[in-house]
């Protein structure tokens, strides 16, 4: 008789999940020689240990501590780029501006980027059929808890001027319920972080509005100011030109506003 399996509302574990995590770990150490000390098999064992045989609605940050320890990494604390709902552009930016880092440029973020995973209580199986959805099922699921944990640590590590890229095309440019709004904003350390600088990325070609005046940006400014961190905001009217100018800052067209 086939064993009854819990049906969750979200997609199941990404296919080839163990192979992908292990391969990404080795690739990361190949790309980043300073991380060559990392034992990728141990990293996978710690990752697996965080969620295998555990109820996928009962995962805690504590479950991920062995993985956090193995993935400890020092990034320049004044070169951190946070993002919300605009991941691709943030990653294109750090690909060009090599001295800046998004969470996905760190080992742990790179390992898990775009993946889904969960297990089942009391069995060593990975659930490839379905995993809990944050809204419909539970918030303490393996994926959500992982990103909450690594995002908190990443924000806590930041210092000086922290940048955040926000999507100006969204109805809520700053969303209190995003990882940035619910985790990272509240874990920036006022004794280390002087300023949070928001870059609001415009979507429309002819959009010349000052999106820094958007009510949600004002709400972000208020939250940040109450935490004794200065706030500044810039409109990025032409993201394509912005990237081009990061690549070639000496280009004559890069002196004008982007």
């Amino acid at each position: 008789v086939p064993r009854w399996r819990q049906q969750w509302s979200g997609p199941g574990t990404t296919k080839r999940f163990p192979e992908t995590v292990l391969a990404r770990c080795v690739k990361y150490t190949e790309i980043h020689p300073e991380m060559r000390h990392v034992d990728c098999q141990s990293v996978w064992d710690a990752f697996k240990g965080a969620f295998i045989s555990k109820h996928p609605c009962n995962i805690t940050e504590e479950d991920y501590q062995p993985l956090m320890k193995l993935g400890t990494q020092t990034v320049p604390c004044n070169k951190i780029l946070l993002w919300s709902r605009i991941k691709d552009l943030a990653h294109q930016f750090t690909q060009v501006q090599r001295d800046m880092f998004t969470l996905e440029d760190t080992l742990l973020g790179y390992l898990a980027d775009d993946l889904t995973w969960c297990g089942e209580f009391n069995t060593s199986k990975i659930n490839y059929q379905s995993c809990p959805d944050w809204r419909k099922d539970c918030s303490n699921n393996p994926v959500s808890v992982f990103w909450k944990t690594v995002s908190r640590r990443f924000a806590e590590a930041a210092c000086d001027v922290v940048h955040v890229m926000l999507n100006g095309s969204r109805s809520k440019i700053f969303d209190k319920n995003s990882t940035f709004g619910s985790v990272e904003v509240h874990n920036l350390q006022p004794e280390k972080v002087q300023t949070l600088e928001a870059w609001v990325i415009h979507g429309g070609r002819e959009d010349s509005r000052d999106l820094c005046q958007d009510p949600t940006i004002k709400e972000l400014e208020s939250i940040i100011s109450k935490r004794n961190i200065q706030f500044s905001c810039k409109n990025i009217y032409r993201p394509d030109k912005f990237l081009q100018c990061v690549k070639n800052p000496e280009d004559s067209s890069c002196t004008s506003e982007i």
Partner: antibody, heavy 120, light 107 residues
Framework: QMQLVQSGAEVKKTGSSVKVSCKAS????????MHWVRQAPGQALEWMGW????????DYAQKFQDRVTITADRSMSTAYMELSSLRSEDTAMYYC?????????????WGQGTLVTVSS | DIQMTQSPSTLSASVGDRVTITCRAS??????LAWYQQKPGKAPKLLIY???SLADGVPSRFSGSGSGTEFTLTISSLQPDDFATYYC?????????FGQGTKLEIK
């Protein structure tokens, strides 16, 4: 079995560009970094750069930074190396190569090479 | 960039000889070194990785040693198939760099 098959020899004019392809088979293309190495006639090997085919992220040797572009097409399991503003010194055999994950980061697998001849 | 200096540039030897090729790095590369064999018109073949580990399918007469800045490739008893050019390569840091090569020829 694991194979890297490169495109055929090219003859190019000075100032033009060349694009060499490297088709991977026998493994999951996105699981490995792909490197490009060149060798001028009678000369030593020279590393040019790498690509992570999963994300398209690249890194290039300073010497080639302004002229080389490495790309990957995941659907075709193929990596490409494009070199622009060709000069006679770019006449060389161009190789794609990758590690084996079990052999440190030495290049355990190589393409057969693509000879690029640049003439004025 | 890390400079890799190989010596000698050319080495003449006979079948059965024991030969040693040296590679010196301009800075500490720990054990992040590979040795390759290349024959005319062919792609290089990995012989040794991590300075002293033998790659799959490579005869045991090949061995590597050293760490830090001084490395050697030894062929214990030269076979006719071993006459080729040998390169060392460091993968401790980008850009990866190769030695200028040692051509092993028949005496």
């Amino acid at each position: 079995q694991m194979q890297l098959v490169q495109s055929g020899a090219e003859v190019k004019k000075t100032g033009s560009s060349v694009k060499v392809s490297c088709k991977a088979s026998g493994y999951t293309f996105t699981d490995y970094i792909m490197h490009w190495v060149r060798q001028a006639p009678g000369q030593a090997l020279e590393w040019m750069g790498w690509i992570d085919p999963e994300y398209g992220r690249t890194d290039y040797a300073q010497k080639f930074q302004d002229r080389v572009t490495i790309t990957a097409d995941r659907s075709m399991s193929t990596a490409y190396m494009e070199l622009s503003s060709l000069r006679s010194e770019d006449t060389a055999m161009y190789y794609c190569a990758r590690s084996a994950h079990t052999t440190g980061f030495g290049f355990a697998y190589w393409g057969q090479g693509t000879l690029v001849t640049v003439s004025s | 960039d890390i400079q890799m200096t190989q010596s000698p540039s050319t080495l003449s030897a006979s079948v059965g000889d024991r030969v040693t090729i040296t590679c010196r790095a301009s800075e500490d590369i720990y054990s992040n070194l590979a040795w390759y064999q290349q024959k005319p018109g062919k792609a290089p073949k990995l012989l040794i990785y991590d300075a002293n580990s033998l790659a799959d399918g490579v005869p045991s007469r090949f061995s590597g040693s050293g760490s830090g800045t001084e490395f050697t490739l030894t062929i214990s008893s030269l076979q006719p198939d071993d006459f080729a050019t040998y390169y060392c390569q460091q993968y401790n840091n980008y850009p990866y760099t190769f030695g200028q090569g040692t051509k092993l020829e028949i005496k």
